[in-house]
């Protein structure tokens, strides 16, 4: 997956830091105070969407072959830049009963991006 460097507008991973204070969660999330969540941004032109390296799945690669040939119903489908690899993160927080919970939360951090 590409890292966004400001030079290309192709689907890439953009760094983004989430501060729990910014969204009002700081009074119940004990740690961390924030984290690099990141997000996906950029274009998914046909020639990119069809390559398995940047594609979300074999399925989207196959569908894209039909889309490029103008086959209905895929002709007007747009390929989107989405997370293809996500990573968990450990969090310490208060649950609904004010008990302290330590949990590895799945899909917290965007590691790589690709075209759907």
């Amino acid at each position: 997956g590409l890292e966004c460097d400001g030079k290309v507008n192709i689907c890439c991973k953009k760094q983004f830091f989430v501060s729990f204070k910014d969204i009002g969660w700081n009074d119940w999330i004990i740690a961390p105070s924030g984290y690099h969540a990141n997000y996906c941004e950029g274009e998914c032109p046909s020639h990119i969407a069809g390559t398995s390296g940047s594609s979300l799945s074999f399925h989207s690669t196959v569908i894209n072959h039909y889309r490029m040939r103008g086959h209905s119903p895929f002709a007007n489908l747009k390929s989107c830049c989405v997370p293809t690899k996500l990573r968990p993160m450990s969090m310490l927080y208060y649950d609904d009963g004010q008990n302290i919970i330590k949990k590895d939360i799945q899909n917290m951090i965007v590691e790589e991006c690709g075209c759907s």
Epitope: I23, G24, D27, D95, D96, G97, K103, I105
Partner: antibody
Framework: QVQLVQSGAEVKKPGASVKVSCKAS????????MHWVRQAPGQGLEWMGV????????NYAQKFQGRVTMTRDTSISTAYMELSRLRSDDTAVYYC????????????????WGQGTLVTVSS | EIVLTQSPGTLSLSPGERATLSCRAS???????LAWYQQKPGQAPRLLIY???SRAGGIPDRFSGSGSGTDFTLTISRLEPEDFAVYYC?????????FGGGTKVEIK
Amino acid sequence: QVQLVQSGAEVKKPGASVKVSCKASGYTFPGYHMHWVRQAPGQGLEWMGVINPSSGDTNYAQKFQGRVTMTRDTSISTAYMELSRLRSDDTAVYYCARARDIAALGLGAFDYWGQGTLVTVSS
Amino acid sequence: EIVLTQSPGTLSLSPGERATLSCRASQSVSSSYLAWYQQKPGQAPRLLIYGASSRAGGIPDRFSGSGSGTDFTLTISRLEPEDFAVYYCQQYVAYPRTFGGGTKVEIK
């Protein structure tokens, strides 16, 4: 300590509207969703809808779609529920209740409730 | 929508007895998203149990919750005078949020 303080009792005529307020204190207001639940005399609890104070996004029960509007003023940590075109069967106690609607963490129970606001609809 | 059916509607028991309240869901509810509330006359509901089996802060250990899938139970091991009230189950896994019809625990 966490407190949800609601506005006082209201008496309304059929066809009118009512706006109930719920002032939050003791916690970070935008960090918790605010739900509204009503209870008709001698009846059970009925969920009306929810507002995310951070974004203003709402989700209403189908029964109340088109008649209910939930808003908030984050500057004064207050949520509002307005019900229009009132009928006699809208006579009930209306509660606000906070929750963190975050399924990934197993969160979402209504841990604090307002004291309730009695709305009487009568001609 | 997920329909929650509570039984019995009324439970007549004496102080010191064991109370068993049932909540059945129309479709499977992950046990992480089932709560029980207690309501006394003229008061707002109070959270007793969340995540089907975890007690909320300040709730005595005579209250316990269990169950999974579609069948959940609230048990009060030994009824105290202050436990006579109405109890509601609620699911918070899906919108619309729904409550059971309630079980009234009254003094026999």
